[in-house]
């Protein structure tokens, strides 16, 4: 029985050229997190593995930094970075939990953070 929930930064926006932190948090479960994958639509951005550390996909090495914690920092944002991002928590014994974040990269300075929300 999967009892955990993932809290994410929800819908967020940021300015072109700036940076943003994508953050997820798994709660309400005692399951052991073995790996967290960060994906943008169907592209793997980074992996944080409990036994190995961080692996950043080669095509994102210049613009992606690990952390804080199990989060991910995206730098030098472009309009093309607009879209859905997923944190995928692989846990034992529960299985997989997925959180969704929507990022909008804006040309102007009207970037504003959305509210946090939970995905069961």
């Amino acid at each position: 029985m999967m009892t955990g929930t993932i809290e994410t930064t929800g819908n967020i926006s940021a300015e072109k050229g700036g940076s943003i932190i994508l953050q997820c948090h798994l709660s309400s479960t005692t399951a052991q997190v073995t790996q967290v994958n960060w994906e943008q639509q169907d592209q793997l951005l980074a992996i944080c593995n409990a036994d190995l550390g961080w692996h950043i996909s080669p095509s994102f090495k210049d613009r992606v930094a690990p952390g804080p914690g199990l989060g991910l920092t995206l730098q030098s944002l472009t309009v093309n970075d607009t879209g859905e991002y997923f944190c995928i928590y692989h846990t034992y014994p529960d299985g997989t939990y997925t959180g969704r974040i929507f990022l909008e990269v804006l040309e102007s300075s009207v970037a504003e953070h959305g509210a946090r929300f939970q995905i069961p």
Partner: antibody, heavy 119, light 107 residues
Framework: QVQLVESGGGVVQPGRSLRLSCAAS????????MHWVRQAPGKGLEWVAV????????YYADSVEGRFTISRDNSKNTLYLQMNSLRAEDTALYYC????????????WGQGTMVTVSS | DIQLTQSPSSVSASVGDRVTITCRAS??????LAWYQQKPGKAPKLLIY???SLQSGVPSRFSGSGSGTDFTLTISSLQPEDFATYYC?????????FGGGTKVEIK
């Protein structure tokens, strides 16, 4: 007791291939990540590759990516390193090693097997 | 990749001396640093993991400290069996990387 024993090293010409083996005993091999680390004569340690417990999660050092392949046979408690397109700079003592789970330190090492790439 | 710079590359010391070896990472690696001891013709031996946790069976005269980019291995009172080469290793990022080593020699 926990033991790792490497084999398969030898002298090989540049461009040729070699497969190293590492026989494990004394622990639950099928539950452990496994690593290869090498040491050129008179030089320091260089991490080479790692493989997940179930054979997934394979990662390599940039210096061997695309030439070396790490694999394992959990039914035989054996780790492998297939080395293709060997170069003189691959000459080294190759160690297999077991990590402390979730601590990211290598606590059990084999005695090493020597690979010499020379024409 | 993360570069680890160890200093000094070699140190001459006497039995009973306090010896300190430093390891500096090119980027922050939190506390994901291990220390190893290697004697000639032997495989490395894990001393410290997680920057400061002593591996089981390792004498308490060995200690590790630091986080972020700067780390230290200290041998509080050097013993004859401690003359060896010491390596740091980071495990925050793949690929894992090792420092160049510090040789502790008899003065």
């Amino acid at each position: 007791q926990v033991q790792l024993v490497e084999s398969g090293g030898g002298v090989v010409q540049p461009g040729r291939s070699l497969r190293l083996s590492c026989a494990a005993s004394g622990f639950t091999f099928s539950s452990s990540y496994m690593h290869w680390v090498r040491q050129a004569p008179g030089k320091g340690l260089e991490w080479v590759a790692v493989i997940g417990a179930d054979g997934s999660n394979k990662y390599y050092a940039d210096s061997v990516e695309g030439r070396f392949t790490i694999s394992r046979d959990n039914s035989k408690n054996t780790l492998y390193l297939q080395m293709n397109s060997l170069r003189a700079e691959d000459t080294a003592l190759y160690y297999c090693a077991k990590p402390v789970p979730r601590r990211r330190g290598l606590d059990v090492w084999g005695q090493g097997t020597m690979v010499t790439v020379s024409s | 990749d993360i570069q680890l710079t160890q200093s000094p590359s070699s140190v001459s010391a006497s039995v009973g001396d306090r010896v300190t070896i430093t390891c500096r990472a090119s980027q922050g690696i939190s506390s994901w640093l291990a220390w190893y001891q290697q004697k000639p013709g032997k495989a490395p031996k894990l001393l410290i993991y997680g920057a400061s946790s002593l591996q089981s069976g390792v004498p308490s005269r060995f200690s590790g400290s630091g986080s972020g980019t700067d780390f230290t291995l200290t041998i509080s009172s050097l013993q004859p069996e401690d003359f060896a080469t010491y390596y740091c290793q980071q495990a925050f990022y793949l690929p894992w990387t090792f420092g160049g080593g510090t040789k502790v020699e008899i003065k």
